[in-house]
């Protein structure tokens, strides 16, 4: 079952997700999506990193941590009730079926 995180309407929500890079800057692609983690990739992607940098995001979604050291925790700004639901953090480790998948449940009060 998903770990549950709470935030209040109008506040920022924080959804933690971490991995350990082989070396700082030697990154593994990560995606964040709205909805449970599918078989591959992320559905409804809101933010993505590649081996170099954060390469895609939409308004209100950003990384507040040191992502080049593996802190890919997602911040969602100024949340509304519509932001409630499951979010997927997927660490896209090279190789077959190596991905680490985390489903996080966001509850907005």
């Amino acid at each position: 079952s998903e770990v549950e995180y709470r935030a209040e309407v109008g506040q920022n929500a924080y959804l933690p997700c971490f991995y350990t890079p082989a070396a700082p800057g030697n990154l593994v692609p990560v995606c964040w999506g709205k909805g449970a983690c599918p078989w591959s990739q992320c559905g409804n992607v809101v933010l993505r990193t590649d081996e170099r940098d954060v390469n895609y995001w939409t308004s209100r979604y950003w990384l507040n941590g040191d992502f080049r050291k593996g802190d890919v925790s997602l911040t969602i700004e100024n949340v509304t009730l519509a932001d409630s639901g499951i979010y997927c953090c997927r660490i896209q480790i090279p190789g077959i079926m190596n991905d680490e998948k985390f489903n996080l449940k966001l509850v907005i009060k």
């Epitope: 700082p24 800057g25 954060v54 308004s59 209100r60 950003w62 941590g65 080049r68 700004e77």
Partner: antibody, heavy 121, light 107 residues
Amino acid sequence: QIQLVQSGPELKKPGETVKISCKASGYTFTTYGMSWVKQAPGKGLKLMGWINTYSGAPTYADDFKGRFAFSLETSASAAYLQINNLKNEDTATYFCARKPPHYYVNSFDYWGQGTTLTVSS
Amino acid sequence: DIVMTQSPATLSVTPGDRVSLSCRASQSISDYLHWYQQKSHESPRLLIKYASQSISGIPSRFSGSGSGSDFTLSINSVEPEDVGVYYCQNGHSFPYTFGGGTKLEIK
């Protein structure tokens, strides 16, 4: 293509107020922060701070707290720098520069052309 | 604030030379170091990010290296249009300070 277009040169007297604009085009304005950088004549670059274009929350470097204010007109994809109670040492070129919102992504990939401010009595 | 120190202040080179510009941070900033070029009467332009990552549209003769507190910008074969001032920037800790710049001149 992505562009940041700033307002024209300004000549002001000490004690006056100036408001410099930076109009963005070619990308979704609220997905990037906007930074302001000062360059005094013949000197290097100094970051003044930046503004979150989604929330409007500004962050000021210590040397630019008090007389300086960042603001937005989101509907016009525009950011503004206002300097109050102008001093001679405010004479400089001011640049706006695009910054991703992520805390550890602090390179500036697009810059305005600069606005020259001259403060003289 | 982290202090960024660049050397030399001025570099006079001949077209075709390979040159190295140095930048030192007053404390470790990992690889959060960015390089900019500013030509006379122009805005700065991002050349390299994260110490060594290339930027789309920037000629391949520009490269960066280093980590921690010591960094280098290299220009493999200087061309006349490379004249200008080169700035390094601390991208690790606010207020993301810039170095004082290295002025590149052509002999």
